[in-house]
């Protein structure tokens, strides 16, 4: 994924502006690209620091521009260096005066170990001086003045890696600024070999590509791409995936491209000459125009791309039949993807012919890490590579690159990934209220750590010390009731926030623990409420035998019906009664009771009672005599509630008889409201009185009632409603 390119625009310096541009194409360097003077190659060059600026036309590129007035200080060797994941890559180049006495045949020369090499300089200026040749700034050879040829050569019959370096030529009276430079690159291995011991065979690197002696990979010349450099780029493009473009009016004219060793420097395809400003002659193409077209079937030769094959033909010389190769294209990849941190499965989809295979599709992270597909499938028209990042994190945000490299060419598509932090509540939920089977919770979803917006919220809960999975409910409001909980159980609660997108579930927030109440004991049995005095009521119940050994007590609640007066009394569990005192006379009270342990029990039904009266009872009302026969009659009445009436007395006697000859009928159930008098005489008049009795005494009747029985043969009158004592 590391594609570093150094463009030396006009290595022969005259009075025109000249520059070095270093481009990191297809990867994002961890550290800035650096451009510096290569003192290893030339120790005694100018010491001035370089003014390195950002190349505004490209995202990851640095530039040094020398104005024409600085021409005298430019001569020398330079490097560009980029670093990614601890690996450094350095590209070297040189600049020299166009007015130098000699000029090199080429700026760099790559040879294989053992090659027979001639390093040549062309004499441009004739001087009556000895010519001298230096290597890396050290003198190695001289030619007497009268023997200096038109082509000055250094001959290396069996080039070795130690022969590599910057060779310079000048007249003895000259200096660095009149020197010509060329750099010899000697591959560590012999031709077509690679490996630490140079005993592996290189793949064919077409179109003047160079086999890297350490890895066996092809370094492709500017204008060609693919594993074997077979595929020509579109016009005026370069780089490992041909996505960099020459912006000049005539494309890549006057651009010298320098690539990592062992490639060195060359013109872009279609150009030649030291300044790369000469077009290829007809029939030639490629970098430095070194490749000759030998197109079959009279196909046309293009100086940039070589043979332009007719449909149905392919290969360098259009020698192979078959579907013409199509440069891969990456499709359906958005420019920007928002991703939630966690697992991420990016997809790279590409077309082309032949269809890309899984090993030809990679994904490059912003730090330069190359990922290979975890899954791969293809249809008739597309290859789909699925990658897996098990844990993508915010630092992984940035420009990622989908890269496809087939025999038909290479393509890369950068896209921006923005990794979001999953939201997590800062606070635990709060428990507002609990019962034995429910809890009311404030989920406290804000504030939260991480990125919004929040799409949904979940309240997670489970019993502590249970191996159960967390249960959850979707929550819309901040207050939520959890139902169907187990009694007397400790629960854990937390909140999970969900943001938009796949895998948007954040980590659950802090945990809150709470315990549900126990199920309450049943109320006391046999409850009975009776008045004891004008200010007391007595509540009694049956003895309580609880099923657990927990401490318990009876809670009695009494409240007045007439007044807003309520009291709760705790009674030890071993008692069976309580006296409710300090009450008001002639007042109705509602009482209920429950048995409590740590948990509260269930309330009993309400019991109602009046305290005893402090006054005489009122006289019974609505007294009616009905259903009169010759020997009986029915008397009915009503009494007022609240006077502690304990009994009703009916007193009757035959009219005219003495007072002491009366009969008293005492009805001790005050709820009875009618009574049938029997054993009366026919056709007799009776005087009837009725009294109410309470704890104070009897009511005072205002008047007596008369009752006359019928003769023996007559039918009775209708009987009134109400309870009747027979």
């Amino acid at each position: 994924a590391m594609d570093l390119i150094l463009i030396n625009s006009l290595p022969l310096v005259s009075d025109a502006e000249t520059s070095l541009t270093c481009i990191a194409s297809g990867w994002r360097p961890h550290e800035p690209i650096t451009i510096g003077r290569d003192f290893e190659a030339l120790m005694n060059q100018h010491q001035d620091p370089l003014e390195v600026t950002q190349d505004v036309t490209r995202e990851w590129a640095k530039k040094v521009v020398w104005k024409r007035e600085k021409a005298s200080k430019i001569n020398g060797a330079y490097f560009c260096e980029g670093r990614v994941r601890g690996e450094a890559i350095r590209i070297r180049t040189m600049k020299m005066r166009q007015q130098a006495s000699f000029l090199p045949a080429t700026l760099t020369m790559t040879v294989d170990k053992g090659d027979n090499v001639n390093i040549s300089f062309k004499k441009v200026l004739i001087k009556e001086e000895d010519a001298v040749i230096y290597k890396n700034g050290s003198f190695i050879h001289s030619v007497p003045r009268h023997e200096v040829p038109d082509i000055l050569e250094v001959h290396l019959p069996h080039a070795q890696p130690q022969d590599a370096g910057v060779y310079s030529a000048r007249y003895i009276g000259g200096n660095l600024f009149t020197s010509a430079f060329t750099r010899l690159i000697v591959r560590r291995c012999e031709a077509q070999k690679w490996g630490p011991e140079c005993n592996h065979l290189c793949t064919a690197c077409m179109n003047n590509g160079v086999c890297h002696e350490d890895t066996g990979e092809c370094i492709c010349p500017p204008g060609f791409m693919g594993r074997t450099c077979e595929k020509a780029c579109e016009l005026h493009t370069f780089g490992r995936t041909c996505k960099e473009r020459c912006s000049g009016q005539e494309g890549c004219k006057s651009y010298v491209f320098c690539l990592p060793d062992p490639y060195g420097c060359s013109c872009a395809t279609g150009w030649k000459g030291l300044q790369c400003n000469e077009a290829c002659h007809p029939g030639f193409y490629g970098p430095d125009c070194k490749l000759r077209c030998s197109c079959n079937n009279g196909e046309m030769c293009d100086r940039f791309q070589g043979c332009l094959c007719s449909p149905g033909w392919q290969g360098l010389q259009c020698e192979r039949e078959g579907i013409p190769r199509m440069t891969p294209k990456i499709v359906d990849l958005p420019d920007h993807i928002e991703v939630n941190s966690g697992k991420f499965n990016p997809i790279c989809k590409a077309s082309g012919w032949p269809l890309p295979t899984n090993e030809e599709m990679t994904l490059v992270k912003p730090d330069g890490t190359v990922l290979h597909p975890k899954d791969f499938n293809h249809t008739d028209h597309f290859s789909v590579a699925i990658f897996t990042i098990h844990r993508i994190l915010p630092p992984d945000s940035g420009v990622w690159v989908c890269s496809v490299n087939t025999v038909a060419g290479m393509v890369e598509k950068p896209f921006n990934i923005s990794v979001k932090v999953l939201p997590k509540p800062l606070n635990a939920p709060n428990v507002i209220d609990t019962g034995h089977n429910f809890a009311v919770i404030n989920i406290s979803s804000e504030p939260y750590f991480g990125d919004g917006p929040i799409k949904s919220k979940k309240l997670l809960y489970k019993p502590v010390n249970h191996y159960e999975a967390w249960q959850h409910i979707q929550v819309t409001n901040e207050i939520v009731t959890l139902n169907y909980l187990e009694p007397r159980t400790e629960y854990e609660l937390c909140v999970q926030l969900v943001r938009r997108g796949e895998g948007g579930e954040g980590h659950p927030g802090p945990v809150r623990r709470f315990t549900t109440a126990s199920i309450g004991l049943p109320p006391p049995r046999g409850l009975n409420l009776l008045p004891k005095s004008q200010t007391t009521l007595n509540l009694t119940w049956q003895p309580i035998f609880p099923s657990s050994e927990d401490d318990f007590y009876v809670e009695v609640e009494r409240r007045s019906v007439q007044k807003s007066d309520q009291q709760n009394i705790k009674v030890p569990g071993n008692l069976t009664s309580v006296l409710l005192n300090n009450l008001h006379p002639r007042e109705q009270y509602v009482v209920r009771a429950r048995v409590n342990t740590k948990a509260q029990g269930e309330w009993s039904e309400d019991l109602t009672a009046w305290t005893l009266s402090d006054i005489l009872p009122p006289q019974p009302e609505n007294i009616k005599i009905s259903n009169i026969t010759h020997s009986s009659a029915v008397i009915s009445w009503t009494i007022l509630d609240g006077y502690s009436i304990s009994s009703i007395t009916i007193r009757y006697k035959v009219q005219g008889k003495n007072e002491d000859q009366h009969v008293d009928v005492k009805i001790k159930n005050a709820t009875i409201t009618q009574y049938q008098l029997k054993g009366l005489e026919p056709e007799t008049a009776y005087q009837v009185d009725i009294f109410a009795e309470n704890n104070i005494g009897s009511s005072n009747p205002a008047f007596s009632h008369e009752l006359v029985t019928l003769p023996e043969s007559q039918a009775p009158a209708d009987l009134g409603g109400g309870k009747m004592l027979l």
Partner: antibody, heavy 117, light 113 residues
Framework: QVQLVQSGGGVVQPGRSLRLSCAAS????????MHWVRQAPGKGLEWVAV????????YYADSVKGRFTISRDNSKNMLQLQMNRLRSEDTAVYYC??????????WGQGTVITVSS | DIQMTQSPDSLAVSLGERATINCKSS????????????LAWYQQKPGQPPNLLMY???TRESGVPDRFSGSGSGTDFTLTISSLQAEDVAVYYC?????????FGQGTRLEIK
């Protein structure tokens, strides 16, 4: 998809000859070096021979040197292994393979050679 | 020639457990000039050709599950399967390509316990 399809296996008597073929598709065959690797029954993998992309360079394992010849016909996308003076220890499954650097990336399906009298 | 020795010869591991296969070379396969180890790992299932898993000792080949990882440097290398799956039952080979001829380890048979 890159494919290597092998043919030419069989049973042969010791001292006789046999020719194995490997047809490549889905790649520019003429750009790649090609290997032969073999695996004796129940045994591990043993590298046999390699040929450069242009056929100029050929290397052999000591165990087959002088008896086996690796060759290629780039016009037909075809790799061959000519095996002469076969021995019983040459009995194996033979695989052709394309390299990715020094590792072997694409393998043929294998062809069985049995050398037996 | 560089000799490659694998250990153990066979290995039985429970499903979901970690499997570790070792490979030792008779000389270093680390190339100092680029700090790369010239070592590959292969998986071979019965009746099938070997399948490239790793190269440069730790670079996973595309399509290989990430439960496979390679480590080590110089002469000692390890292939690790973090959580064994049923489909991982196979013979595993290491191979050096530091020097020709390329040579393979004798193989490690991995089975389910």
């Amino acid at each position: 998809q890159v494919q290597l399809v092998q043919s030419g296996g069989g049973v042969v008597q010791p001292g006789r000859s046999l020719r194995l073929s490997c047809a490549a598709s889905g790649l520019t065959f003429s750009n790649y070096a090609m290997h032969w690797v073999r695996q004796a029954p129940g045994k591990g993998l043993e590298w046999v021979a390699v040929i450069s992309y242009d056929g100029e360079n050929k290397y052999y394992a000591d165990s087959v040197k002088g008896r086996f010849t690796i060759s290629r016909d780039n016009s037909k996308n075809m790799l061959q292994l000519q095996m002469n003076r076969l021995r019983s220890e040459d009995t194996a499954v033979y695989y052709c393979a394309t390299p990715k650097g020094g590792a072997l990336e694409i393998w043929g399906q294998g062809t069985v050679i049995t050398v037996s009298s | 020639d560089i000799q490659m020795t694998q250990s153990p010869d066979s290995l039985a591991v429970s499903l979901g457990e970690r499997a570790t296969i070792n490979c030792k070379s008779s000389q270093s396969v680390l190339f100092s000039s680029n700090n790369k180890n010239y070592l590959a790992w292969y998986q071979q299932k019965p009746g099938q050709p070997p399948n490239l898993l790793m190269y440069w000792a730790s670079t996973r080949e595309s399509g290989v599950p990430d439960r496979f990882s390679g480590s080590g440097s110089g002469t000692d290398f390890t292939l690790t399967i973090s959580s064994l799956q049923a489909e991982d039952v196979a013979v595993y080979y290491c191979q050096q390509y530091y020097s020709a001829p390329i040579t393979f380890g004798q193989g490690t048979r991995l089975e389910i316990k």
